[in-house]
């Protein structure tokens, strides 16, 4: 009987899917200088692998395209019944394509008050990301950077000292009380004020030097 | 033998309502459209309703149409005929009877004994 | 809706005779022309279908023919068992329609 290990060694192995991977293992490419490796791939091995991804990606696009078909099956047959025509004769089957008829101007009208309703909310939508532009266009906005920081570093340099109690939200969630709102408005106020305080270099180094 | 027995009927007075039922076998129920079909005491045959073989169609003549409703329970091998604002006009015998067609034309061709419905006040 | 109306509402004749009954349509429904049976206990059933095929089970002295309005169910050998009232039926449009009936009497 044959060992079923010693069959598998010597079949040629497939190539592992290759592996996504995320744009910062990229980073360093970019940033340090390396020299370039000689590839230990033959050509032919190469065009091995490549027809090997290429079938891969195939059969996934045929699987998807089945899937999207029996959705699509599953769909219509949950909205369209099937016809049940034994018994019927030609009498029936002219009244019930009128019904089908009627049924399909009933769905007509009804596509359309929703159309009509969907362009209203579009328009509206539009209005209002429009007045969203508008508004932010009244404000000075700084320019930003990318900067590595820590989130409680972030969170001393936003609310100062208040920075360790604002950590525990939910405890500090539960003492708010009807009175505070008052209070809390003032806050946001402040806090926005911070903000622009630090806007550009020179406001945050003062910050951080504190 | 293709068999059908029809129950339900009975005296009510104008506006009442009532439920018919036929009990079917001797055949597969759920391939067939069924029927309904009264007999007025004058002796006139009238058409009253039919329904498709899975009961997602059913035709009415205008008649009866929005007071009675034909339905079927296919795992029961029954048909329904649920009759509401019934007027004195309605009063008749009631056959249950199953469809068949031939070329386009349909007819009806196993009947029941009948079911008797008399409205009056 | 069509209107199916019979020549006459009741026939007499001896058994053993041949018989005639005629039914018309108000309009053209392309053989799609029923004949039922009711007996004098109320039980009915159905003899021709489509102009002139015989149902299963019935008698060949039975046969239909006609076509567009005019239609006729003829009865060759009159029996006893054949005394009862004949209904034509078209199922060309809804509502289905019945003539009035015609009775069959003996002479």
């Known amino acids: 009987m044959a060992d079923g290990s010693s069959d598998a060694a010597r079949e040629p192995r497939p190539a592992p899917a290759p592996i996504r991977r995320r744009s910062s293992n990229y980073r360093a490419y970019a940033t340090e200088p390396h020299a370039k490796k000689k590839s230990k791939i033959s050509a032919s091995r190469k065009l091995q692998l490549k027809t090997l991804l290429l079938q891969i990606a195939k059969q996934e696009l045929e699987r998807e395209a089945e899937e999207r078909r029996g959705e699509k099956g599953r769909a219509l047959s949950t909205r369209c019944q099937p016809l049940e025509l034994a018994g019927l004769g030609f009498a029936e089957l002219q009244d019930l394509c009128r019904q089908l008829h009627a049924r399909v101007d009933k769905v007509d009208e009804e596509r359309y008050d929703i159309e009509a309703k969907v362009t209203k909310n579009i328009t509206e939508i539009a209005d209002l990301t429009q007045k969203i532009f508008d508004l932010r266009g009244k404000f000075k906005r700084p320019t930003l950077r990318r900067v590595r920081i820590s989130a409680d570093a972030m969170m001393q340099a936003l609310l100062g000292a208040r920075a360790k109690e604002s950590l525990d939200l939910r405890a500090h969630l539960k003492q708010v009380k009807k009175e505070d709102t008052e209070k809390e408005n003032r806050e946001v106020g402040d806090w926005r004020k911070n903000i622009d305080a630090l806007s550009g270099m020179e406001g945050r180094k003062k910050k951080f030097e504190s | 033998e293709v068999q059908m027995v029809e129950s339900g009927g009975g005296l009510l007075k104008p506006g009442g309502s009532l439920k018919l039922s036929c009990a079917a076998s001797?055949?597969?129920?759920?391939?067939?459209?069924m029927s309904w079909v009264r007999q007025t005491p004058e002796k006139r045959l009238e058409w009253v309703a039919t329904?498709?073989?899975?009961?997602?169609?059913?035709f009415y003549p205008d008649s009866v149409k929005g007071r009675f409703t034909i339905s079927r329970d296919n795992a029961k091998n029954t048909l329904y005929l649920q009759m509401l604002s019934l007027r004195s006009e309605d009063t008749a015998m009631y056959y249950c009877?199953?469809?068949?067609?031939?070329?386009?034309?349909?007819?009806?061709?196993?009947w029941g004994q009948g079911s008797s419905v008399t409205v009056s006040s | 809706d069509i209107q199916m109306t019979q020549t006459s509402s009741s026939l007499s004749a001896s058994l053993g005779d041949r018989v005639t009954i005629s039914c018309r349509a108000s309009q053209e429904i392309t053989n799609y022309l029923n004949w039922y049976q009711q007996k004098p206990d109320g039980t009915i059933k159905l003899l021709i279908y489509?102009?002139?095929r015989i149902h299963s089970g019935v008698s060949s002295r039975f046969s239909g023919s006609g076509s567009g309005t005019d239609y006729s169910l003829t009865i060759s050998n009159l029996e006893q068992e054949d005394i009862a009232t004949y209904f034509c039926?078209?199922?060309?449009?809804?509502?289905?329609t019945f003539d009035t009936g015609t009775k069959l009497e003996l002479k």
């Open positions: 001797g055949f597969t129920y759920s391939n067939y459209a």
């Open positions: 009877a199953r469809r068949d067609n031939y070329y386009g034309s349909s007819f009806m061709d196993y």
């Open positions: 039926q078209q199922g060309h449009t809804i509502p289905l």
């Open positions: 489509y102009t002139s």
């Open positions: 329904i498709s073989s899975g009961g997602s169609y059913s």
